[in-house]
Interface confidence: low
Amino acid sequence: RAQLERSLRDVVEKTIQKYGTNPEETAAEESWDYVQFQLRCCGWHYPQDWFQVLILRGNGSEAHRVPCSCYNLSATNDSTILDKVILPQLSRLGHLARSRHSADICAVPAESHIYREGCAQGLQKWLHNN
């Protein structure tokens, strides 16, 4: 089990680092989006894992960006953000995120309504229970 956890972490690390770089190869990204969406988590240890991904990094004045699957809908009251940005992109995740052809990326607003927990613990619990 420990070996499986290490292997899973390695796969996730690679998926995060390569997120959005190849529109033709999105299977791993879509799977990870679905994990984040279902487990209500973001990144491996922290949402900050995404901030280092080159394709997601803005310049110093821009908001950090994360996959839209990181958004916590229940904590977001801003209907503009919900209707125009997040819901159209998250709606695809309801179909196991299989219809997506390119990475869906959302800016993190000043008030961070993204899942604050990384996915590591949830996935480790799932592995232990299965």
Epitope: R6, E13, Y46, Q48, F51, Q52, A75, A110, S112, R116
Partner: antibody, heavy 115, light 107 residues
Framework: VQLVQSGAEVKKPGSSVKVSCKAS????????MNWVRQAPGQGLEWMGN????????TYNRKFKGRVTLTVDKSSSTAYMELSSLRSEDTAVYYC?????????WGQGTLVTVSS | DIQMTQSPSSLSASVGDRVTITCRTS??????LAWYQQKPGKAPKLLVS???TLAEGVPSRFSGSGSGTDFTLTISSLQPEDFATYFC?????????FGQGTKVEIK
């Protein structure tokens, strides 16, 4: 971004101390708040952190049971309370915000434990 | 707990020198490693996050490298304001731990 901590404290062994950290210049609930201490001439020791949005805490096992982290969202202030003080708790206590590494730190609060 | 071994514990160098500080962790921390600079009487300042990403406003003479268990902080050309103590820190698993520090002194 600014983190302003409360002033120096002198405490007796066995008592408690509560240090405050007032945040400004950013969204208080968007970052975790950590507490790190540094004994005179020594290295840095992470005590734990709190998520101001949900109130969840993570403690260093070494301090569990003695340290309590809280926040007051209305005033954007974090608090660290350390109980059952002993002489080896004499240190500078820092608050530091994070989403991952700690990017902004308070100026530090010296807590002296002496009989 | 993950142990952090920093070396050297102190070093003497001159302005313009290239300085390298290493940090070794007892377990794989992937890229969850930060470097901080601390001057006497001051709070630590974040220099590098995620092993190699320079924090905002940090001069380009600083660079970080490594992943897994072996990490390096390099100052390509030491400046007078760089004389300080440097700490590495992992933020991989609870509890976060720091290296014991490297004091960079004037030769």
């Amino acid at each position: 971004v600014q983190l302003v901590q409360s002033g120096a404290e002198v405490k007796k062994p066995g008592s408690s101390v509560k240090v405050s950290c007032k945040a400004s210049g950013y969204s208080f609930t968007g970052y975790n708040m950590n507490w790190v201490r540094q004994a005179p001439g020594q290295g840095l020791e992470w005590m734990g952190n709190i998520d101001p949005y949900y109130g969840g805490t993570t403690y260093n096992r070494k301090f569990k049971g003695r340290v309590t982290l809280t926040v007051d969202k209305s005033s954007s202030t974090a608090y660290m309370e350390l109980s059952s003080l002993r002489s080896e708790d004499t240190a500078v206590y820092y608050c530091a915000r994070s989403v991952g590494p700690m990017d902004y730190w308070g100026q530090g609060t010296l807590v002296t434990v002496s009989s | 707990d993950i142990q952090m071994t920093q070396s050297p514990s102190s070093l003497s160098a001159s302005v313009g020198d290239r300085v390298t500080i290493t940090c070794r962790t007892s377990e794989n921390v992937y890229s969850y490693l930060a470097w901080y600079q601390q001057k006497p009487g001051k709070a630590p300042k974040l220099l590098v996050s995620s092993a190699k990403t320079l924090a905002e406003g940090v001069p380009s003479r600083f660079s970080g490298s490594g992943s897994g268990t072996d990490f390096t902080l390099t100052i390509s050309s030491l400046q007078p304001e760089d004389f300080a103590t440097y700490f590495c820190q992992h933020h991989s698993d609870n509890p976060w731990t720091f290296g014991q520090g490297t004091k960079v002194e004037i030769k």
